[in-house]
């Protein structure tokens, strides 16, 4: 005897159409796109009934139910506003991901996405993955360089990406982006195995206030071109957080250098150094302290630390050095892995030009300069450990 | 936010019948596509579904333990109510309720250890 | 009730790509499910339908199915997915779960 005649379920249609199903035949259901099948309260990935012997169907007729995406992901620094409706997230509803303002900034799409038939939250260019807020980077309180003095005070939100690394020294390092830190690798080598050990705070110009923003390490690089005790060439390292930090006014990463940086780092062109090392009166600065110098001319520095006790081929093509002929002006032991800043007036952002490394014996004197590594060589070697890792 | 925990006794003597009980925060068992599943884990072993209900009343059972076992739910206090009768040494497991939407198990209780014995 | 057959074990080192696989008569024309398990707590969905992330979860989780077998990929593996993972689907109203698979990440 033949079966009842299937009736599609709203949303639906029957295949294949027939004027009657006898003993073995069969229909499918298939849905209208943004609506899926459902048996009971199961979504069912396809449907198909069998008339049997006895005139049933050997299964229940399914339900066509509106597709729905669910809620949205979390969007790290950033949120979710809901554009259809309150809560709307079924077939065709649209969200608006946007980041957090001042501090963030979208990268990958415009933010907007569309609950599409297969039941994923989708960006104009055909994207299922969630937008990336990015810190922004380069943000300071302070608006020009320029003038050179010397053993200033900092003010809140001058050095926001500055990094105090305790660990055997002091020492101290830059923020990149919301989970790295760029500092020396003369002043992490001995943690090079141990990065638990160090001891990273951030968002604090006093080096001794309890009121700070505790990092710790998960692993440190040292770059691979270093040799601890043979000179400074290839001073440079980065420290992987083992979390992101919240960027706010007072901890917000430095900017790398652009190609076009070293139209800003010219002889005589003013960097600004900041650090709680040694001042003129030999101890550890309590509060953050910087001093705007003026980059040397290479050859000058060269020559500079061609005499004894220095061993010829100290400074290097990885290096660049700041400073006054007059002396006075200098970072010192404490400052080490440090930020040397410049202002790309093209950008309004400050950008990391060096990272404190080595000088004289005896810090800010005469005829002598900071000796710092040299960035803008090393953005290849950062971007791969940064993708890599 | 969703929750779910179970409660009932952690031992029950063979051929007692076990009752637990699953309440629920955070959605309803009375709208929606949700439903409310029970599961099961002996010590060191793999999980094991044994029966759910859905909002609309909709009732399903483990086949090998259909006869053993009655799931129901009161929409008024939030709870979800298994009984597994003539309970034996080897039901001895953690019991699991879980609400399930979409089709996926999305949010367990803690669980609770039940252990039968003399 | 029918059996769903994953490997008791998998072993895989940090960074690289883990696959887990769940095979059943005829799986492919079922949603199939991921549930992750770590020692002395709730298992926890890490796919659905197939192939789709429960919101929470990162995107090196993904699923595929096809034929009679289910996978589950973890792509740049951490330390943090040890654990013991369980894939499931149902047959008529009923569920039925895998029988388990133990991912070690090596040191």
């Known amino acids: 005897q033949p079966c009842p005649y299937p009736m599609a379920p709203p949303n639906g249609h029957v295949s294949p159409v027939q004027a009657k199903y006898i003993l073995k035949d069969s229909f499918s259901i298939f849905c209208e796109t943004g609506y899926e099948l459902l048996q009971g309260h199961l979504p069912l990935k396809s449907f198909t009934a069998v008339c049997q012997k006895d005139g049933s169907w050997d299964r229940p007729m399914p339900a066509c139910s509106i597709v729905d995406c669910g809620p949205p992901d979390d969007l790290p620094s950033g949120r979710v506003e809901y554009i259809t409706g309150p809560g709307v997230t079924t077939y065709k509803a649209v969200i608006q991901y946007s980041c957090e303002e001042t501090f963030y900034t979208m990268k990958v799409n415009d933010g907007k996405y569309v609950c599409e038939a297969d039941g994923f939250w989708t960006s104009s260019k055909g994207e299922k993955s969630l937008p990336v807020c990015e810190p922004v980077c380069g943000l300071s309180a302070r608006t020009t360089g320029g003038r050179i003095y010397g053993g200033q005070k900092a003010k809140p939100g001058d050095f926001p990406w500055q990094v105090l690394i305790l660990g055997g020294t002091t020492a101290a390092g830059a923020l990149l982006y919301d989970n790295w830190v760029l500092t020396a690798a003369h002043a992490v080598y001995e943690q090079k195995h141990d990065a638990s050990a160090l001891d990273i705070r951030m968002g604090t110009l006093k080096r001794l206030s309890p009121h700070y923003t505790q990092a710790w390490s998960e692993a440190v690089f040292i770059h691979e071109g270093y040799t601890h005790d043979a000179g400074f060439d290839n001073d440079i390292a980065l420290i992987k957080l083992n979390n992101k930090v919240v960027i706010n006014s007072n901890i917000t990463p430095i900017c790398l250098p652009r190609k076009e940086a070293e139209s800003f780092m010219r002889t005589d062109d003013i960097g600004t150094a900041s650090g709680w090392g040694l001042t003129q009166r030999g101890f550890l600065a309590r509060n953050l302290m910087y001093v705007d110098i003026p980059i040397v001319d290479h050859q000058k520095c060269t020559a500079a630390y061609e005499k004894p006790p220095y061993p010829r081929g100290s400074v290097t093509a990885n290096m660049l050095c700041a400073g006054l002929e007059s002396g006075g002006k200098d970072s010192c032991r404490g400052d080490a892995g440090g930020a040397l800043v410049f202002l790309d007036s093209e950008t309004e952002r400050w950008f990391v030009g060096g990272i404190v490394s080595w000088g004289s014996m005896n810090c800010g004197e005469a005829g002598q300069y900071g000796v710092y590594t040299k960035v803008i060589n090393y953005i290849p070697w950062i971007e791969n450990i940064i993708s890599d890792f | 936010q969703v929750t779910l925990k179970e409660s009932g006794p952690v031992l029950v003597k063979p051929t007692e019948t076990l009752t637990l009980t699953c309440t629920v925060s955070?959605?309803?068992?009375?709208?929606?596509?949700?439903?409310v599943s029970w599961i099961r884990q002996p010590p060191g072993k793999a999980l094991e579904w044994l029966a759910h209900?859905?909002?609309?009343?909709?009732?399903s059972y483990r086949t090998s333990l259909k006869s053993r076992l009655t799931i129901s739910k009161d929409t008024s206090k939030n709870q979800v109510v298994l009984t597994m009768t003539n309970m034996d040494p080897v039901d001895t497991a953690t019991y699991y309720c879980?609400?399930?939407?979409?089709?996926?198990?999305?949010?367990w209780g803690q669980g609770t250890l039940v252990t039968v014995s003399s | 009730q029918p059996v769903l057959t994953q490997p008791p074990s998998v072993s895989v080192s940090p960074g690289q790509t883990a696959s887990i696989t769940c095979s059943g008569d005829?799986?492919?024309?079922?949603?199939a499910y991921w549930y992750q398990q770590k020692p002395g707590h709730s298992p926890v969905l890490v796919i659905y339908?197939?192939?789709k992330r429960p919101s929470g979860i990162p995107g090196r989780f993904s699923g595929s199915n096809s034929g009679n077998t289910a996978t589950l990929t973890i792509s740049g593996t951490q330390a943090m997915d040890e654990a013991d993972y369980y894939c499931?689907?149902?047959?008529?109203?009923?569920?039925?779960f895998g029988t388990g698979t133990k991912v070690t990440v090596l040191a």
């Open positions: 005829k799986l492919g024309d079922k949603f």
């Open positions: 879980a609400r399930i939407r979409a089709g996926g198990i999305d949010y």
């Open positions: 209900i859905f909002s609309s009343d909709e009732k």
């Open positions: 499931q689907a149902w047959d008529s109203s009923t569920a039925v």
């Open positions: 955070g959605f309803s068992l009375s709208r929606g596509k949700m439903g």
């Open positions: 339908q197939d192939n």
